[in-house]
């Protein structure tokens, strides 16, 4: 049978040939011609055999971490017969471990965040090193962790690699720490290999600082011309915390001012002093307010750091501004009758200098040839007015300080021109009609209406009459419909185209104004030869076609 012991070969042997052991058949007694053969993965390349003795050698440096086991086959042949002396047998060569691998931290880089002021014992992070050596081979892969850098703030548990806080830390003094951890194999015994890793530990902020004003007094100025909402300056408090914990809110202490307000710019963390109500230098030229500042978010457990809010005093000086004249009213509306003579009184406007020096005021009316204004603000007409041309004037009055002509104010002036009855009523259109030669008496020839350019306080009422001459001429008559229209009727039977081809009727139209005005208007009536049906045949004036009245072609 086969004779061999367990085969071991140490890894990382530097010799070109390392004797591992000997395969031997117990039939090999020196009096026979035996030849030993090695087969399988690694035979001839990694391992060789002395065919004569069965001695096995490793001829390559082996790495257990790459391959820890080789399974080979052995044969023994009698050279004389060529036959196998023993059945082919499988055997194992184990690569024995040496401590040739240092511990490695595979999860680098390590970074941890822990709140500042965390108590001792707070877990920060666990670091883990890996050793490629055989964990079952002595202590080659048994690790011990230690702290090379990071005392006295941190500690590491020797067997687990858990890093804990060992002393409170204030982020405002130092916000990050580099901790260096060493892992040693051989449980730290002589000959141990080591690896190190760096852990960046960042302290996250907690709200353990209140905002504090850097200045105890701020001096600001505001122009009396500044509109409400104007930012007149900024105040600034400083908070050693960061982020949300440094967000602050500024406010004015109660009952301090109705004139100013403070809003917080949450991007810059500045307090912006805002004008809440317009100031007047002539009324009050300085103010004093007290501002306070608090953090926006303060958890209950951190209130002890925020017991008393920081305050500051703000002195605000109002700057005098040469203000433009101020009119008594925001606008003026005056009335004047049309046709009043040039120089007629329209109204009076008044503006004053609000400043202490009370400069005299000069007035002007912009873009007007119809009105004048004097230095007292009295407005008069410079031309006769016609309501029927312009019923309203939209003007602008300018007041200028005599001592500073750049100080100007303007306001609207509205002048309404009032109506007087200065227009008689007249035909609403030109009327021209016809009458048939065979027309009977009382036949309606034309309906007429009138218009009046005047404005009527009540409704217009027009009165229609024939002139005295036409009244005496009995060919036509008029009836007033009492609705601002009238009808013309024939006053006889039969007309003669040859004798009298056309009639011109004068119609008087009067209005109901005081005094009443009357106009004379002419109506033209043509005599036509009409068929039995009443359709027009021939008129001397021209051929007339009856189609909803006359149409000239």
């Amino acid at each position: 049978g086969w004779v061999w012991n367990q085969f071991f070969v140490p890894e990382e042997m530097n010799t070109t040939s390392h004797h591992i052991g000997q395969l031997r058949s117990d039939l090999d007694n020196g009096n026979n011609s035996f030849q030993y053969k090695l087969l399988g993965a690694g035979a001839g390349s990694t391992f060789i055999i002395d065919e004569r003795t069965g001695d096995i050698y490793a001829i390559q440096k082996l790495d257990r971490e790459e391959r820890s086991l080789y399974i080979l086959r052995a044969q023994v042949i009698d050279i004389a017969t060529g036959r196998a002396v023993e059945p082919e047998s499988e055997f194992v060569i184990k690569v024995s471990d040496i401590n040739d691998n240092e511990p490695k931290f595979l999860d680098e880089p390590y970074e941890a965040i822990v709140p500042e002021m965390s108590p001792e014992g707070t877990l920060v992070i666990q670091v883990t090193a890996s050793d490629a050596d055989d964990p079952s081979s002595g202590n080659n892969a048994r690790l011990l962790y230690s702290l090379l850098q990071g005392q006295p703030y941190f500690s590491v548990e020797p067997t687990t690699g858990v890093i804990r806080i060992s002393s409170k830390m204030d982020r405002e003094l130092q916000d990050e720490y580099w901790v260096i951890i060493q892992a040693k194999d051989m449980i730290g015994q002589p000959g141990a290999l080591s690896g190190t890793t760096s852990v960046l530990i960042k302290l996250s902020d907690v709200n353990d600082n209140k905002p504090i004003f850097k200045e105890s007094l701020y001096r600001l100025t505001v122009s009396e011309s500044a509109p409400t909402g104007t930012s007149i300056g900024t105040i600034m408090a400083y908070d050693n915390d960061i982020g949300e914990n440094a967000e602050m809110d500024y406010s004015i202490e109660e009952d301090d001012s109705q004139t100013f307000d403070i809003i917080t710019n949450h991007e810059t963390q500045e307090g912006i002093v805002i004008l809440k109500k317009k100031v007047d230098f002539e009324h009050q030229n300085h103010y004093g307010i007290r501002a306070k500042v608090k953090n926006h978010h303060v958890p209950e457990q951190l209130m002890k750091y925020h017991t008393e809010a920081s305050t500051t005093f703000i002195k605000i000086q109002v700057e005098d501004v040469d203000e433009p004249p101020l009119f008594l009213l925001p606008y003026y509306v005056f009335e004047v009758f049309e046709e009043t003579p040039q120089g007629s009184f329209v109204g009076v406007v008044s503006a004053t200098d609000p400043d202490n020096r009370k400069s005299p005021i000069r007035y002007s009316i912009t873009r007007s040839k119809v009105f004048n204004i004097n230095d007292n603000g009295t407005i008069t007409t410079s031309n006769s007015l016609d309501r029927e041309i312009s019923a309203w004037y939209n003007l602008s009055i300018t007041a200028t300080e005599k001592y500073n002509i750049e100080q100007i104010s303007s306001i609207p002036l509205y002048v309404q021109v009032l109506n007087i009855n200065d227009h008689a009523p007249e035909f609403s259109q030109y009327y021209e009609t016809y009458v048939c030669e065979n027309a009977g008496s009382g036949q309606v020839i034309q309906t007429i209406s009138a218009v009046d350019r005047d404005e009527s306080i009540e409704e217009h009422h027009f009165y229609f009459n024939l002139s005295v001459e036409d009244t005496n001429n009995s060919s036509f008559t008029i009836i007033d419909n009492q609705d601002n229209t009238a009808v013309i009727l024939t006053n006889r039977t039969g007309f003669n185209l040859q004798e009298e081809p056309v009639f011109y009727i004068s119609i008087l139209i009067a209005d109901n104004g005081i005094p009443s005005l009357t106009s004379t208007n002419t109506l033209t009536i043509h005599v036509c030869d009409c068929g039995d049906s009443g359709s027009t045949q021939t008129c001397q004036y021209q051929e007339l076609v009856l189609s909803m009245g006359f149409k000239t072609e």
Epitope: G30, S33, Q35, R52, T53, I79
Partner: antibody, heavy 120, light 108 residues
Framework: QVQLQESGPGLVKPSQTLSLTCTVS??????????WSWIRQHPGKGLEWIGY???????FYNPSLRSRVTISVDTSKNQFSLKLSSVTAADTAVYYC????????????WGQGTLVTVSS | EIVLTQSPGTLSLSPGERATLSCRAS???????LAWYQQKPGQAPRLLIY???SRATGIPDRFSGSGSGTDFTLTISRLEPEDFAVYYC?????????FGQGTKLEIK
């Protein structure tokens, strides 16, 4: 009667390759049952086994020289050869070829030896 | 590797005397695989004994070998003038084959 005869240059320069041939007469290398060996003897010193070859070409070398030694066989010429690379003065020796009997495993026939001097 | 130590380094004897040469192994060697060689100046070694005790072809019977394990002996019962030479033991039980440093047998 088996006879072995070494041949090759007697002087080799350092770092070069020493090459020797052993011619076998009175028997065939191919007949089997024998391993063909090289042994050397430093001047005034003991014997050092270098390695062997079987007619099939399988070899085994002394681990101390393994990285520099090559033994080859030419059955058609009934010869086997030794090459030793990167020689130094320490390789100056008398080089013997010998037959290793498969049954006794002892070196029963030897060549007369050839002195190889390594020198520049 | 197995180290073979021969003693004495030099043995001075007269012809007709009995010579006893010793070979000690650093670890046990199978008796089947120990040989003795004789080398005369300017000559190649010659096989005397193999398998610790078997004489090679043509070797006179005054040469005999014995021993086992780690201690082996070559005995020359009656020294002849031609027997004065250097004697080497060799093991071929395990690789690499190793020789002893030799015992010089000289005429007294």
């Amino acid at each position: 009667q088996v006879q072995l005869q070494e041949s090759g240059p007697g002087l080799v320069k350092p770092s070069q390759t020493l090459s020797l041939t052993c011619t076998v007469s009175g028997g065939s290398i191919s007949s089997g049952g024998y391993y063909w060996s090289w042994i050397r003897q430093h001047p005034g010193k003991g014997l050092e086994w270098i390695g062997y070859i079987y007619y099939s070409g399988s070899t085994f070398y002394n681990p101390s020289l393994r990285s520099r030694v090559t033994i080859s066989v030419d059955t058609s010429k009934n010869q086997f050869s030794l090459k030793l690379s990167s020689v130094t003065a320490a390789d100056t020796a008398v080089y013997y070829c010998a037959r290793d009997s498969s049954s006794s495993r002892a070196l029963d026939y030897w060549g007369q030896g050839t002195l190889v001097t390594v020198s520049s | 590797e197995i180290v073979l130590t021969q003693s004495p380094g030099t043995l001075s004897l007269s012809p007709g005397e009995r010579a006893t040469l010793s070979c000690r192994a650093s670890q046990s060697v199978s008796s089947s695989y120990l040989a003795w060689y004789q080398q005369k100046p300017g000559q190649a070694p010659r096989l005397l004994i193999y398998g610790a005790s078997s004489r090679a072809t043509g070797i006179p019977d005054r040469f005999s070998g014995s021993g086992s394990g780690t201690d082996f002996t070559l005995t020359i019962s009656r020294l002849e003038p031609e027997d004065f030479a250097v004697y080497y033991c060799q093991q071929y039980d395990s690789s690499p084959r190793t020789f002893g440093q030799g015992t010089k047998l000289e005429i007294k």
